[in-house]
Amino acid sequence: ATKLTEEKYELKEGQTLDVKCDYTLEKFASSQKAWQIIRDGEMPKTLACTERPSKNSHPVQVGRIILEDYHDHGLLRVRMVNLQVEDSGLYQCVIYQPPKEPHMLFDRIRLVVTKGFSGTPGSNENSTQNVYKIPPTTTKALCPLYTSPRTVTQAPPKSTADVSTPDSEINLTNVTDIIRVPVFN
């Protein structure tokens, strides 16, 4: 069996996780993609998914999670804003490919969110929290429910699956950008 590897990221409450998951462009550009959490002893749970077929660069927001699939680059950008301590856990990007089970994109992400200000050099430590204005977006497709012997992904609660968000406000203080693919200049 393939050994599953993890990348660990330690962030502070209020920061933003910004991950780019790369996939094989030719095979998966239009495939529906999802962001999942894997809790100890439980099957992976789908927190958010792109539309089906996945639209190029179309932002899909579910709560504090924003997904953007960039077909030109074979990259799924995942942002989790206003991180909370309880967001700590193991996450993964997957590609839905029914009737086969989801294809996991390496590596898994071990997120550790701790309390306290980030103290990022150059950031304003005395500033009050800033408001993150989420533009209205709508996800048309429900995240599918899979039940396979090795991997099960559950659909999120109904309230988060079919979302229309009119100017939600999320408190946000800082962002840590995680680039998991090479960037050329």
Epitope: D18, S57, Y70, G122, N130, K133, V175, D177, V183, F184
Partner: antibody, heavy 121, light 107 residues
Framework: QVQLQESGPGLVKPSETLSLTCAVS?????????WAWIRQPPGKGLEWIGS???????YYNPSLKSRVTISVDTSKNQFSLKLSSVTAADTAVYYC??????????????WGQGTLVTVSS | EIVMTQSPATLSVSPGERATLSCRAS??????LAWYQQKPGQAPRLLIY???TRATGIPARFSGSGSGTEFTLTISSLQSEDFAVYYC?????????FGGGTKVEIK
């Protein structure tokens, strides 16, 4: 080095369509990067109009989206801007520029020298 | 869209002095911020991208710092050719947005 040169009419009548072309030299558009149009009304600040990738994927400023079309011609190594239903408020210096390699690396370098487009009857 | 606010609108500095320009984003943009210099009748010139990386050919007296929502451009010792308008721009998400600019003038 990479150079960009805007061309197109300097005077457009209200309600007509503004059309500009940006010729790129020293770099092949099809090699990557985003290519952008930015404008600057006289005495004012900068406004991003939109960007295009060599694949043809386009990204527009929502404030202009209904009127803007950006296209690319890789065979001529150029990209173009069309802005419909123009008014006096669209009078500006229009710049073309090379963006970054990814959507989140959207800085602009280098820039064309800019071309002033006046909307007037 | 993300609103970028620059301050001050005008900065009067003597040659050889240090200039500090500020830029604030209405929401966090990580380190995805650029700075440009524009002189009258010219196109803007990229100085800094990624909040702190100097563009090719930019003198070391220009430095950028900050992350999240608060950013600073510092010109350590102003030269005569540095008097211009400076713009910040977030390059994190569409639509890309610019600040209103800071004019650095001779005191």
């Amino acid at each position: 080095q990479v150079q960009l040169q805007e061309s197109g009419p300097g005077l457009v009548k209200p309600s007509e369509t503004l059309s500009l072309t940006c010729a790129v030299s020293g770099y092949s558009i099809s090699s990557g990067y985003y290519w952008a149009w930015i404008r600057q009304p006289p005495g004012k600040g900068l406004e991003w109009i939109g960007s295009i990738y060599h694949s043809g994927s386009t990204y527009y400023n929502p404030s202009l989206k209904s009127r803007v079309t950006i296209s690319v011609d890789t065979s001529k190594n150029q990209f173009s801007l069309k802005l419909s239903s123009v008014t006096a408020a669209d009078t500006a210096v229009y710049y073309c520029a090379r963006g970054g390699p990814y959507p989140w690396s959207g800085w602009f370098d280098p820039w064309g020298q800019g071309t002033l487009v006046t909307v007037s009857s | 869209e993300i609103v970028m606010t620059q301050s001050p609108a005008t900065l009067s500095v003597s040659p050889g002095e240090r200039a500090t320009l500020s830029c604030r984003a209405s929401q966090s943009v990580g380190s995805n911020l650029a700075w440009y210099q524009q002189k009258p009748g010219q196109a803007p010139r990229l100085l800094i991208y990624g909040a702190s990386t100097r563009a090719t050919g930019i003198p070391a007296r220009f430095s950028g710092s900050g992350s999240g929502t608060e950013f600073t451009l510092t010109i350590s010792s102003l030269q005569s050719e540095d008097f211009a308008v400076y713009y910040c721009q977030q390059h994190d998400v569409w639509p890309y947005t610019f600040g209103g600019g800071t004019k650095v003038e001779i005191k």
